[in-house]
Interface confidence: low
Amino acid sequence: GWVWNQFFVPEEMNTTSHHIGQLRSDLDNGNNSFQYKLLGAGAGSTFIIDERTGDIYAIQKLDREERSLYILRAQVIDIATGRAVEPESEFVIKVSDINDNEPKFLDEPYEAIVPEMSPEGTLVIQVTASDADDPSSGNNARLLYSLLQGQPYFSVEPTTGVIRISSKMDRELQDEYWVIIQAKDMIGQPGALSGTTSVLIKLSDVNDNKPIFKESFYRFTISESAPIGTSIGKIMAYDDDIGENAEMEYSIEDDDSKIFDIIIDNDTQEGIVILKKKVDFEQQSYYGIRAKVKNCHVDEELAPAHVNASTTYIKVQVEDEDEPPVFLLPYYILEIPEGKPYGTIVGTVSATDPDRRQSPMRYYLTGSKMFDINDNGTIITTNMLDREVSAWYNLTVTATETYNVQQISSAHVYVQVFNINDNAPEFSQFYETYVCENAESGEIVQIISAIDRDESIEDHHFYFNHSLEDTNNSSFMLTDNQDNTAVILSNRTGFNLKEEPVFYMIILIADNGIPSLTSTNTLTIQVCDCGDSRNTETCANKGLLFIMGFRTE
């Protein structure tokens, strides 16, 4: 049978030939009677066999990383007979590894981001080198990682390539680091090959800095005439952090009057001090307020870095302005009874100069020629007032400072004219009254009512009476209904159109005012030929024909 051991050939041998081993048959007695042959890929070119001894040699330099094993076939022939001594057999030559490949970092470039101030041991990134040598052959592909650059901030786990933080770093001092990692094969023993890679490690920001005011004191001025919302000035704090961690908010700490507010300019991160309420130089000429600044977003674990928030003192000087006069009241309601003679005092308005110099006032009145005003602000009537003409007057009083006539203010003055009983009641309408010739005694001729132009605090009550002077007129009688109406009744049966076509009845109407006023009113009653119907509806037309000279039967 065949006799051989496992065949190995080291790669990258520089010798012209290298003995690998011997192929032999146990029938070979050394008499040089057998011929050994090598067949298969590489036979004759890469590997040669001594046909006498069966010794195999490699005659070419081999690269295990290109090809790690060769499968060949062996034959042994009896030279004398030409027959095979042993059956053809397959065998393997393994190319044994030498450390001829350095570790390579295939995933370059490496870049990692890690939060600043991360504790020791924090994992940053894992770098992995590959070694083309045989991992099963000794230590040729067993790698050890070490740090060439990056101490004392980083360390690398020798066997895993895991980079960890070994010292806390402050982004505000340095925001990125170049770390150089070396990978050595042969677990770092002599003859090891190495490769290096650079890792860019960027520190991401954490909110470990509180904002601090640039100035401890700010001085601003504001005109007392400035409207609410006016920007008074800008304050500025700086924060070494970036992005969201530098976002800040300002607030006012000491401002009991709640006159000022601070809003933030999101573009510049400046605090804009604005007016929240109107200021008055004469009331307070300066304000001292304290502003505080803090970050908008603070993680709980970083809260200790944000205690004792930065503050600044702001002095706001109020500038005096020449202000227009100020009326004591926003508007005035004055009252006067009607019927008073002209020159009657209605009331007084008053305006003052809010400024320190206290300019005297001059007053002007518009809105009605029925009133005038003097320099004391006293309003008087220029005519007798009649409530029934106008019950209210809407006046405007203008005050100007005598020292500066440009400074003007106005106030509305509403004058209410009170009613007095100066109007007697009268018929509420014109009555066209008819009585039929054939009217009977007690028949209703007319119902009358009255009106009074005066205003009544309570309801008007009118009293109707037949004038005592009207003694010759007994054909009709008046009855007061006690409801502000009265009824006129026929006091006889039958009237004669031809003899007495018209009757005039004098009626007195009195009101319930104090004192009471009474009016005398005449009711004209026309006699009408109504026919059998005793209906006066057609009397108006007949009266019209009668007046025009026609006569109807």
Partner: antibody, heavy 122, light 108 residues
Framework: QVQLQESGPGLVKPSETLSLTCTVS????????WSWIRQPPGKGLEWIGY???????NYNPSLKSRVTISVDTSKNQFSLKLSSVTAADTALYYC????????????????WGQGTMVTVSS | DIVLTQSPGTLSLSPGERATLSCRAS???????LAWYQQKPGQAPRLLIS???SRATGIPDRFSGSGSGTDFTLTISRLEPEDFAVYYC?????????FGQGTRLEMK
């Protein structure tokens, strides 16, 4: 300079578990191998086992079934647990450092703790 | 396991004399991975020699180590009073690591 300090109870009852901790100060626990060695009273030294900072261990086969060595890199500490103790485990227990990288797989113990005496008794 | 046998068990010498301590291994110690330690009462062992012959940092040059394979020697060329202690050899070429039983060097 690196210093080692053993700590743990000085008295353990038989059949219970002996627990010791070694605190490394003055340097990092990383990149070195850390061993436990014991010395019974009046006797020689016996290697118990080592741990690498990534957690890989190698124990003396004579104690392997009862020994657990663990590491806590955040505290710079490594610990020994020896279960089912008997009076034969009464000894002075040392922690020590050896560096794998200076020569071959193991190296001599260049830094030792001062030792802690553990007595196994009921 | 590799068994290390130290001889003599006790060595009585005077200061100024030369001390020779022997350590024999039950099988060859790979790579001459053998160390020597000195231990004084109440103290932890102190590394003297590693790799059979390399002096540890801070060890006086009167201490020297030699040997390979199975036979190793620690020599103290001129004994000082502070050298009197127990000396242990240790092999770390093959797991498990083992120690010799120790040689007590005492003052005569």
């Amino acid at each position: 300079q690196v210093q080692l300090q053993e700590s743990g109870p000085g008295l353990v009852k038989p059949s219970e578990t002996l627990s010791l901790t070694c605190t490394v100060s003055g340097g990092s626990i990383n990149s070195y191998y850390w061993s436990w060695i014991r010395q019974p009273p009046g006797k020689g030294l016996e290697w118990i086992g080592y741990i690498y900072y990534i957690g890989s261990t190698n124990y003396n086969p004579s104690l392997k079934s009862r020994v657990t060595i663990s590491v806590d890199t955040s505290k710079n500490q490594f610990s020994l647990k020896l279960s089912s103790v008997t009076a034969a485990d009464t000894a002075l227990y040392y922690c020590a450092r050896d560096s794998r990288y200076r020569s071959g797989w193991y190296d001599a113990f260049d830094i030792w703790g001062q030792g802690t005496m553990v007595t196994v008794s009921s | 396991d590799i068994v290390l046998t130290q001889s003599p068990g006790t060595l009585s010498l005077s200061p100024g004399e030369r001390a020779t301590l022997s350590c024999r291994a039950s099988q060859s110690v790979a790579g001459s991975y053998l160390a020597w330690y000195q231990q004084k009462p109440g103290q932890a062992p102190r590394l003297l020699i590693s790799g059979a012959s390399s002096r540890a940092t801070g060890i006086p040059d009167r201490f020297s180590g030699s040997g390979s394979g199975t036979d190793f020697t620690l020599t103290i060329s001129r004994l000082e009073p502070e050298d009197f202690a127990v000396y242990y050899c240790q092999q770390y070429g093959k797991s498990p690591i083992t120690f010799g039983q120790g040689t007590r060097l005492e003052m005569k």
